[in-house]
């Protein structure tokens, strides 16, 4: 039997059986988890699950810009700390910076400090490019 | 009331550069990204750039190449543009202004001149 | 870059008039435009974001509209404290571009 590699829509790319989305169009949090959705194939801000999933994403990101932080699918959305992924994964992998926390910033964002392989917190009304993901 | 004060006209020579500051007050300074805008005499509004207060984080128009640098001072809430290099194609008023959610609220201007 | 083409330029308009200026981007912008207002030595004023949200404190003769490539600012009944220039500016994209401007003044 011939496995066929599932094909991403156009301009999205293909790794580890999802499909990703970068987008560099400028939207506070919550527009660019309802322009992911919008995408349909059960698309949300992207959830990012381990290191090498970080790693590719990355590579595929500074292909591309290098300064920009991007908003990824992790929100606190009680407020207390209690952080989760928007397309329910687990919250198990983590990746944050050294002064990501506190304050009134509850939505992530992959930062450009570090190559976008860690994360930080900011105010979620601030307008960024984002990153979708769905699986196909 | 949210209120952005920009510092007062400049007159330098070219060659010479120039800071011009925004100082914020009545609202939480790093929750909103502050963005600066040119207007040449008579001419209509072009962006410089943006600054995220929370990280420092910046984005350049590419047009004006090198010329702006946006950096900003949380303990004060200020907001600053340094510009170089100047020349007399520089001469403009520029604005700070506080990009929101729904709506942005602008500085009252900083006018600059460039002159021997 | 987003070019945007703001039209007209400028325009003379009777009190009690309905005054209507267009914005046409040169991709889809979804809707990320806002409007402002500026008086002689004074700085710009938001009149519109998103399209069509009016500003709080905004008085309701004015509104916006559109989608896509296409956009306007209309005043319903025109006051003599509404001349002015006016803008628009996309913020969908970097960097963030504004129209050339139309001056608005009273007949």
């Known amino acids: 039997d011939i496995i066929m590699r599932p094909s991403c829509a156009p301009g999205w790319f293909y790794h580890k059986s999802n499909c990703y989305g970068y987008f560099r169009k400028l939207r506070n949090w919550s527009d660019a988890e309802l322009e992911c959705q919008s995408y349909g194939n059960g698309a949300h801000l992207a959830s990012i699950l381990s290191l090498k999933e970080a790693s590719t994403i990355a590579e595929y990101i500074s292909g591309y810009q290098r300064s920009q932080p991007i908003w990824i699918g992790l929100h606190d959305p009680q407020k207390r700390q209690q952080w989760q992924w928007i397309d329910g994964a687990m919250y198990l992998y983590r990746s944050w910076s050294g002064k990501s926390m506190g304050g009134n910033k509850h939505c992530a964002e992959m930062s450009s400090n570090n190559n976008f392989l860690t994360w930080s917190s900011n105010e979620c009304n601030k307008r960024q490019h984002f990153l979708c993901k769905y699986r196909p | 009331e949210i209120q952005l004060q920009q510092s007062g006209p400049e007159l330098v020579k070219p060659g010479a550069s120039v800071k011009v500051s925004c100082k914020a007050s009545?609202?939480?300074?790093?929750?909103?990204?502050m963005y600066w805008v040119k207007q040449s005499h008579g001419q209509s509004l072009e962006w410089i750039g943006r600054?995220?207060?929370?990280?420092?984080?910046?984005t350049y128009n590419q047009k004006f190449k090198g010329k702006p640098t946006l950096t900003v001072d949380r303990s004060s809430s200020t907001a600053f543009m340094h510009l170089n290099s100047l020349t007399s194609e520089d001469s403009a008023v520029y604005y700070c202004?506080?990009?929101?959610?729904?709506?942005?609220?602008w500085g009252q201007g900083t006018t600059l001149t460039v002159s021997s | 870059d987003i070019k945007m083409t703001q039209s007209p330029s400028s325009m003379y308009a009777s009190l009690g008039e309905r005054v209507s200026i267009t914005c046409k981007a040169s991709q889809d912008i979804n809707s990320f435009l806002s409007w402002f207002q500026q008086k002689p030595g004074k700085s710009p004023k938001t009149l519109i974001y998103?399209?069509?949200g009016l500003v709080d404190g905004v008085p309701s003769r004015f509104s916006g509209s559109g989608s896509g490539q296409d956009y306007s600012l209309t005043i319903s009944s025109l006051e003599y404290e509404d001349m002015g220039i006016y803008y628009c500016l996309q913020y969908d994209e970097f960097p963030y571009t504004f129209g050339g401007g139309t001056k608005l003044e009273i007949k």
């Open positions: 009545g609202y939480a300074f790093t929750s909103y990204n």
């Open positions: 202004a506080r990009e929101g959610y729904d709506y942005d609220v």
């Open positions: 998103r399209a069509n």
């Open positions: 600054i995220d207060p929370h990280n420092g984080v910046t």
